[in-house]
């Protein structure tokens, strides 16, 4: 089938990084500067993405692959292939239409992006708060009361095998 196809369509022989030039009797021509073709048999080359403004180049365009962008410091990528850059906030904040705002009491954000989330309600799992939450950090819930009783087993998961010569303590 491939052989038949190549006899019928000379363009199928053009490798990535070239295009099938109709103006030149369908011979394979290299992609012009600032363009690429990532697959063979292409009749045109695609224009390279340009990383401008708040975008910066993470990977240069080549004849066979598009440029890849990320965001300048203080911004982070959003969308497939970093199609947008969004402003960073500090931990303990979230981005609103009016800019970065501190998390309300009872909520936290431990990243420079995303929204403030409510502290975990430990009591829903029958646990109590071991470490209080802050704007930057969720609460830490202690173990369940059953884990603390005198009869509680020391081991939840099975213990890993020790190296020879090491006796358990």
């Amino acid at each position: 089938f491939e052989r038949t196809r190549s006899l019928q369509d000379p363009c199928s022989n053009c490798p990535a990084g070239t295009f099938c030039d109709n103006n030149r009797n369908q011979i394979c021509s290299p992609c012009p500067p600032n363009s690429f073709s990532s697959a063979g048999g292409q009749r045109t080359c695609d224009i390279c993405r340009q990383c401008k403004g708040v975008f910066r180049t993470r990977k240069e365009c080549s004849s066979t692959s598009n440029a890849e962008c990320d965001c300048t410091p203080g911004f982070h990528c959003l969308g497939a292939g970093c199609s947008m850059c969004e402003q960073d906030c500090k931990q303990g904040q979230e981005l609103t239409k009016k800019g970065c705002k501190d998390c309300c009491f009872g909520t936290f954000n431990d990243q420079k992006r995303g929204i403030c989330r409510p502290w975990t309600n430990c009591s829903l799992d029958g646990k109590s708060v071991l470490v209080n939450g802050t704007k930057e950090r969720d609460v830490v819930c202690g173990p369940s009361p059953a884990d603390l009783s005198p009869g509680a087993s020391s081991v939840t998961p099975p213990a890993p095998a020790r190296e020879p010569g090491h006796s358990p303590q």
């Epitope: 431990d110 975990t120 430990c122 071991l130 470490v131 950090r137 609460v139 819930c141 173990p143």
Partner: nanobody, 116 residues
Framework: EVQLVESGGGLVQAGGSLRLSCAAS????????MAWYRQAPGKQREFVAV???????KYGDSVKGRFTISRDITKNTVDLEMNSLKPEDTAVYTC??????????WGQGTQVTVSS
């Protein structure tokens, strides 16, 4: 399920020091907290110390100023430095990986005995 293995326990005289270490099979910063608990025979398990992913620490009242919890994220270990040990510190010390949702993972524990 993370697996935790404690080491460093032993017999020590009152006023002495020990350093316990807890080696975790998984990334310790993925838990809400890594903690040490202790349990004396016939008693309830008692909170000793905890360290959160951002490095915040908290201590049980009976060990404040004497014990220090620390961690090494690259080695996935959590250590407990115990100074000015007292006979009442005698217990099995157990490392715990705390999850806000889900069960706590426990190590096997290491025995600490402080003689007077």
């Amino acid at each position: 399920e993370v697996q935790l293995v404690e080491s460093g326990g032993g017999l020590v005289q009152a006023g002495g020091s020990l350093r316990l270490s807890c080696a975790a099979s998984g990334a310790i910063f993925s838990y809400n907290g890594m903690a040490w608990y202790r349990q004396a025979p016939g008693k309830q398990r008692e909170f000793v110390a905890v360290i959160t992913p951002d490095g915040t620490t908290k201590y049980g009242d009976s060990v404040k100023g004497r014990f220090t919890i620390s961690r090494d994220i690259t080695k996935n270990t959590v250590d407990l430095e115990m100074n000015s040990l007292k006979p009442e510190d005698t217990a099995v010390y157990t490392c715990a990986a705390l999850r806000n949702s889900g069960s706590t993972s426990w190590g096997q524990g290491t025995q600490v005995t402080v003689s007077s």
